[in-house]
Amino acid sequence: QAVPPYASENQTCRDQEKEYYEPQHRICCSRCPPGTYVSAKCSRIRDTVCATCAENSYNEHWNYLTICQLCRPCDPVMGLEEIAPCTSKRKTQCRCQPGMFCAAWALECTHCELLSDCPPGTEAELKDEVGKGNNHCVPCKAGHFQNTSSPSARCQPHTRCENQGLVEAAPGTAQSDTTCKNPLEPLPPEMSGTMLM
């Protein structure tokens, strides 16, 4: 079991993740672990020498880079916010700000846009991952209503008048709640849509 550096005639190395082929000397050398970079290249008699990334820089993977990548903040102008800081082993972790979804993706989200409103009588279908796509509005299920235009409002169950010792004056719809009234009082026309106690 040879340890780097070792000769390789077929230009491949045993451990592709942690070793790389160095064509000048036709040898396999060690890559540097995450959080480090190559400070001295390998030779036939000496393996790669690695050094820790300086503050504000990182390398995420086993590498044979001679520099670390500069940490960059998430861009609030593009609708992004930070969920985790940059460290020597990972870049800054970003996500779309609340009420936004990812509109442009290039290995990671680069641009977020405002979620569309769902009209009354509908709500946004719940997604596995927040911020991944725009709202898909679905009708409120039976017995529920939603009376605003909003990207985030949820359908609520209709009020059950009997639970409050009242009777139904007007049934609920997908866009409005049940109207209740006191069983002893008739509901004047101008009071429709309100709850009389």
Partner: antibody, heavy 116, light 107 residues
Framework: QVQLVQSGAEVKKPGESVKVSCKAS????????LHWVRQAPGQGLEWMGW????????QYNEKFKGRVTITADKSTSTAYMELSSLRSEDTAVYYC?????????WGQGTTVTVSS | DIQMTQSPSSLSASVGDRVTITCKAS??????VAWYQQKPGKAPKLLIS???YRYSGVPSRFSGSGSGTDFTLTISSLQPEDFATYFC?????????FGQGTKVEIK
């Protein structure tokens, strides 16, 4: 060498606001995050939020959202933390700190006392 | 938010003793944990970052270990200047959170 020098102690009444400053030197102010952390008497440490002076963007701990504002003045390499609607529970030492895999650099702390 | 539960809350020890302080995260934080020492009236001082890397100028008697949810700070041979309060902190995700502290007192 990196230095963070904070403004002096403050005594405030409930409902008032306080603004604490943190002057940075010894490094490029615009390329490092500056955080604010507070410590109530005899208590632990509580992270409040950060500012990235390069673009002026700040993010806050939800607990303080709406009450805390962190700003930075690039021309003087100074960060500010303003806390409004003060209550007695806000009596604490407030620290600014520069981050990198933890907080290697801290200000000396500013004592804020809230008392009627 | 991630909770950092530190134990013990206080301990009494003698010069030369080996002291161990533990910190448990409520969810996986990888190795993104720092340890601090704080003396009365002073700002905290960074001892360990990335769970086990000693910060520059920190004596070799301080060591850190752990990953995921369980972390340990060890002082191999307690010195008079080590009597202080120690805090752990996770910087894996926002909001950053700290342990409640361990006060190391003279026996």
């Amino acid at each position: 060498q990196v230095q963070l020098v904070q403004s002096g102690a403050e005594v405030k009444k409930p409902g008032e606001s306080v603004k604490v400053s943190c002057k940075a030197s010894g490094y490029t102010f615009t390329t490092y995050y500056l955080h604010w952390v507070r410590q109530a008497p005899g208590q632990g440490l509580e992270w409040m939020g950060w500012i990235y002076p390069g673009n002026g963007h700040a993010q806050y701990n939800e607990k303080f959202k709406g009450r805390v504002t962190i700003t930075a003045d690039k021309s003087t390499s100074t960060a500010y933390m303003e806390l409004s609607s003060l209550r007695s529970e806000d009596t604490a030492v407030y620290y600014c700190a520069r981050s990198w895999e933890g907080f290697p650099y801290w200000g000396q702390g500013t004592t804020v006392t809230v008392s009627s | 938010d991630i909770q950092m539960t530190q134990s013990p809350s206080s301990l009494s020890a003698s010069v030369g003793d080996r002291v161990t302080i533990t910190c448990k995260a409520s969810q996986n934080v990888g190795i993104n944990v720092a340890w601090y020492q704080q003396k009365p009236g002073k700002a905290p001082k960074l001892l360990i970052s990335s769970a086990s890397y000693r910060y520059s100028g920190v004596p070799s008697r301080f060591s850190g270990s752990g990953s995921g949810t369980d972390f340990t700070l060890t002082i191999s041979s307690l010195q008079p200047e080590d009597f202080a309060t120690y805090f752990c902190q996770q910087y894996d995700t926002y909001p950053f959170t700290f342990g409640q502290g361990t006060k190391v007192e003279i026996k």
